[in-house]
């Protein structure tokens, strides 16, 4: 998996989207987890509703929300009131039994200021951005 970089500004909200094949992952719940080290496990942050048919309902854990458009095939994670310690490597996962498939690897970056963005123009909005090297950056 390539890594997609999402950049947000401290104190603001950041929305992360994870597209997937809706047919392949039909009936599967989804989760958002944080990779705590090179070899460590992916620590679950939040998962979609226990009833797959209700996956569209937003579920919160602290300042992190998850909602799943199961027909369109888009998992959306919202990080509210973004803080520096929210930065890190995450995964969108599709769950089946005790197994989990990685839908997307996501690197969340929290900037002190919108103008800290590497390629900042006159205006910069948080989210998804340009590709470079093996990463895909979103803003």
């Amino acid at each position: 998996h390539n890594t997609t970089v999402f950049q947000g500004v401290a104190g603001q909200s950041l929305q992360v989207s994870c597209p997937y094949d809706s047919m392949k992952h039909w009936g599967r719940r989804k989760a958002w987890c944080r990779q705590l080290g090179e070899k460590g496990p992916c620590q679950r942050v939040v998962s979609t509703h226990n009833l797959w048919l209700l996956s569209f309902l937003r579920r919160w854990n602290g300042s992190t929300a998850i909602t799943d458009d199961t027909l369109g095939g888009t998992l959306t994670i919202t990080l509210r009131n973004l803080q520096p310690h929210d930065a890190g490597l995450y995964q969108c996962q599709s769950l089946h039994g005790s197994e989990a498939d990685t839908l997307r690897k996501v690197l969340v970056e929290v900037l002190a200021d919108p103008l800290d963005h590497r390629d900042a123009g006159d205006l910069w909005f948080p989210g998804e951005s340009e590709s470079f090297e093996d990463a895909h950056v979103e803003h």
Partner: antibody, heavy 121, light 107 residues
């Protein structure tokens, strides 16, 4: 073993610029944030800013914006900080400090030995 | 910016004595605090992170705790190598800020 080797002491003239380095070893350089910290003689520590070596994204303490520029060279696993328009106020020891995995969510576990910068005519 | 008020600024104590240093945060930092030790040669070492988690290799006589916005570092029984400068660091929000430091000296 994680090591951060900083460049040696420098004596520079007011108005000049200086670029110091922090060579990392013992870990995957691009996986960990790198912070820079200032300590003026006999004073406390001040956070200057942080760089994500993987993307090059930076965040600065507003106080040091325009004064410090953080960069990395991934091929040599080296982080750099350039200070410009130097004055006597910039005379200090500067430390690089490694963060945690793609973040600073556990603070700064590893520190360099510091680079002494003296600004004098 | 979050102010970290560290006390005392200096402390004289004897070998074997129990000492506590405190940092008070001006805003909520939710336990995102670490304690650092700086030796006279300038070497800096992290002792504690997440307010109370001891770094590997750090002697168990060091401990960290939290009470509301007050964070403490306690050394249960001072040893000669503990005489140094100590700083707290909050990494909850930008800009990260340090306490003013405590100089721990031998009485």
């Amino acid at each position: 073993e994680v090591q951060l080797q900083e460049s040696g002491p420098v004596l520079v003239k007011p108005g000049a610029s200086v670029k110091m380095s922090c060579k990392a070893s013992g870990y995957t350089f691009t996986d960990y944030y790198m912070n820079w910290v200032k300590q003026s003689h006999g004073k406390s520590l001040e956070w200057i800013g942080v760089i994500n070596p993987y993307t090059g994204a930076t965040s600065y303490n507003q106080k040091f914006k325009g004064k410090a520029t953080l960069t990395v060279d991934k091929s040599s696993s080296t982080a750099y900080m350039e200070l410009n328009s130097l004055t006597s106020e910039d005379s200090a020891v500067y430390y690089c400090a490694r963060g945690t995995y793609y973040s600073n969510y556990e603070g700064f576990p590893y520190w360099g030995q510091g680079t002494l910068v003296t600004v004098s005519a | 910016d979050i102010q970290m008020t560290q006390s005392p600024s200096s402390l004289s104590a004897s070998l074997g004595e129990r000492v506590s240093l405190t940092c008070r945060a001006s805003q909520e930092i939710s336990g995102y605090l670490s304690w650092l030790q700086q030796k006279p040669d300038g070497t800096i070492k992290r002792l504690i992170y997440a307010a109370s988690t001891l770094d590997s290799g750090v002697p168990k006589r060091f401990s960290g705790s939290r009470s509301g916005s007050d964070y403490s570092l306690t050394i249960s029984s001072l040893e000669s190598e503990d005489f140094a400068d100590y700083y707290c660091l909050q990494y909850a929000s930008y800009p990260y800020t340090f306490g003013g430091g405590t100089k721990l000296e031998i009485k």
